[in-house]
Interface confidence: low
């Protein structure tokens, strides 16, 4: 009779994480008598995966009923595969011995590769807001994938970006890998509603890449433009001065009116108007009782936006151009939401 051969027909098996791996093994003969064992790896440090004779292996099931005496199929299934299960598995035939069984012949081995999906990409932007024309960095991270080959792309509103650097770690062999990418994005004034998308394509995703997004609304600061204008006289001794604060983002804004350098009123933007591009407009007005001033008045609209240094715009109010004094107090009123840029 021909000597027993242990046949492992599959050089390699590729399994997605969480699925079940089937490792095939058949013997050409029932002789010599003795059990089959499965190992991961070779040599003295090999790991026992299954022993036909004894032991408890909860993740392993046999394909055939090994108790049948004519059984020559020693294939096994390993459930709930993780990247840590990757390696070369050997089906080894033992010959019954005393006191211990003796290794008789080994199969050629089957390499189990685990395809693990990358985790959902996490995109994070800069810690501090930046203004248009500035370049900001976004990072994208995804972990736990295998095999190592992976493609990462960056998009801004569907348009692919090219200025980025990507690393996959570790460089050597590993059960799973991580990817880290940093993209540079130049902000524009229209980016309040923009999205930066990190797209990860991997063999495990079957053509349906994973995406992580960051809204540039959390990154951008669009500083306001100010315009101070004097409205027609509403009453003989009153002048209405408006400060139009346009195209700013985010909404956090405090406005202070100064009369000749002295604070007249401070208010916080509340009822703002949203522009199509996501920026905001706001208008504040100051009703100045000119009769309370003997000299010309310098009115300043000072705006502190999102904690940044204040910007201001001034308007010189010529007192001499108005009727003679009536009354003595300076009155002030304010309003909100009142302006919209026409694109």
């Amino acid at each position: 009779e021909e000597e027993l051969q242990v046949i492992q027909p599959d050089k390699s098996v590729l399994v997605a994480a969480g699925e079940t791996a089937t490792l095939r093994c058949t013997a050409t003969s029932l002789i010599p008598v003795g059990p089959i064992q499965w190992f991961r790896g070779a040599g003295p440090g090999r790991e026992l995966i299954y022993n036909q004779k004894e032991g408890h292996f909860p993740r392993v099931t046999t394909v055939s009923d090994l108790t049948k005496r004519n059984n020559m199929d020693f294939s096994i299934r390993i459930g709930n595969i993780t990247p840590a299960d990757a390696g070369t598995y050997y089906c080894v035939k033992f010959r019954k011995g005393s006191p211990d069984d003796v290794e008789f012949k080994s199969g050629a081995g089957t390499e189990l590769s685990v395809r693990a999906k990358p985790s959902a990409p996490v995109v994070s932007g800069p810690a501090a807001r930046a203004t248009p024309q500035h370049t900001v960095s976004f990072t994208c991270e995804s972990h736990g994938f295998s095999p190592r080959d992976i493609t990462l792309k960056w998009f801004k509103n569907g348009n692919e970006l090219s200025d980025f650097q990507t690393n996959v770690d570790p460089v050597g062999e590993s059960v799973s890998y991580s990817i880290h990418s940093t993209a540079k994005v130049v902000l524009t004034r229209e980016d309040v509603h923009s999205q930066v998308i990190c797209e990860v394509a991997h063999v495990t995703l079957q053509g349906d890449p994973l995406r992580g997004t960051a809204n540039l609304s959390e990154t951008i600061r669009v500083p306001p433009t100010l315009e101070v204008t004097q409205q027609p006289v509403r009453a003989e001794n009153q002048v209405n001065v408006t400060c139009q604060v346009r195209k700013f983002y985010p909404q956090r804004l405090q406005l202070t009116w100064l009369e000749n350098g002295n604070v007249s009123r401070t208010e916080t933007a509340s009822t703002v108007t949203e522009n199509k591009d996501g920026t905001y407009n706001w208008m504040s007005w100051l009703l100045v009782n000119v009769s309370a001033h003997r000299d010309d008045v310098k009115l300043t609209c000072q705006v502190e936006h999102d904690g940044q240094p204040a910007v201001s715009k001034s308007h010189d109010l010529k007192v001499s151009a108005h009727p003679k004094e009536q009354g003595s107090n300076t009155a002030a009123e304010n309003t909100g939401s009142n302006e919209r840029n026409i694109y």
Partner: antibody
Framework: QVQLQQSGAELMKPGASVKISCKAT????????IEWVKQRPGHGLEWIGE????????NYNEKFKGKATFTADTSSNTVYMQLSSLTSEDSAVYYC??????????????WGQGTTLTVSS | ENVLTQSPAIMSASLGEKVTMSCRAS?????MYWYQQKSDASPKLLIY???ILAPGVPARFSGSGSGNSYSLTISSMEGEDAATYYC?????????FGGGTKLEIK
Amino acid sequence: QVQLQQSGAELMKPGASVKISCKATGYSFTKYWIEWVKQRPGHGLEWIGEILPGSVITNYNEKFKGKATFTADTSSNTVYMQLSSLTSEDSAVYYCTKWGLYDSDDGVDYWGQGTTLTVSS
Amino acid sequence: ENVLTQSPAIMSASLGEKVTMSCRASSGVNYMYWYQQKSDASPKLLIYYTSILAPGVPARFSGSGSGNSYSLTISSMEGEDAATYYCQQFTSSPYTFGGGTKLEIK
């Protein structure tokens, strides 16, 4: 839930004027622009203009200046478009529409059901 | 005004077929919006900011493009996709629409 409810169909004579209404519910009426769009039978869409109800600021397509006039009534959350000196060219379906990305979970763009205007002698 | 030219004006596609239609602007635009309109119904926003799907829009729809050239793609045509599709720009007033692409089932 955001809704734009437009007034019913109108049959008008040439030279007359008509006022179409668009009642808004389900959001902060004064904060968001209402736009008007024209669609003639078998034709595409034409942007007429827009109004911000809170401030009554308007932007008109140059082509419709003198033809369309927008007004708003904040007490009833209603925007109106008046079309004057009607001709057969004004026969169309008129839509009011609203854009507002952050004011609702179930959409970013809302349209009225349309008002059909027929101009015929 | 910025003239948007859609092509083709009329097209037909079989169920399951990939469909692509284009919108060209006479002047560059920042973003493109796409609407779907079925007969006797109001237009419905499909895509805004060139590529972002509006809530409830199936993932088979996608948008791309920049500058003067934009496109709308349906990865696999379904019966309910038969409609007229319009592009619109909001970069410069008046906010013009394209002439539309009528998509029919083959």
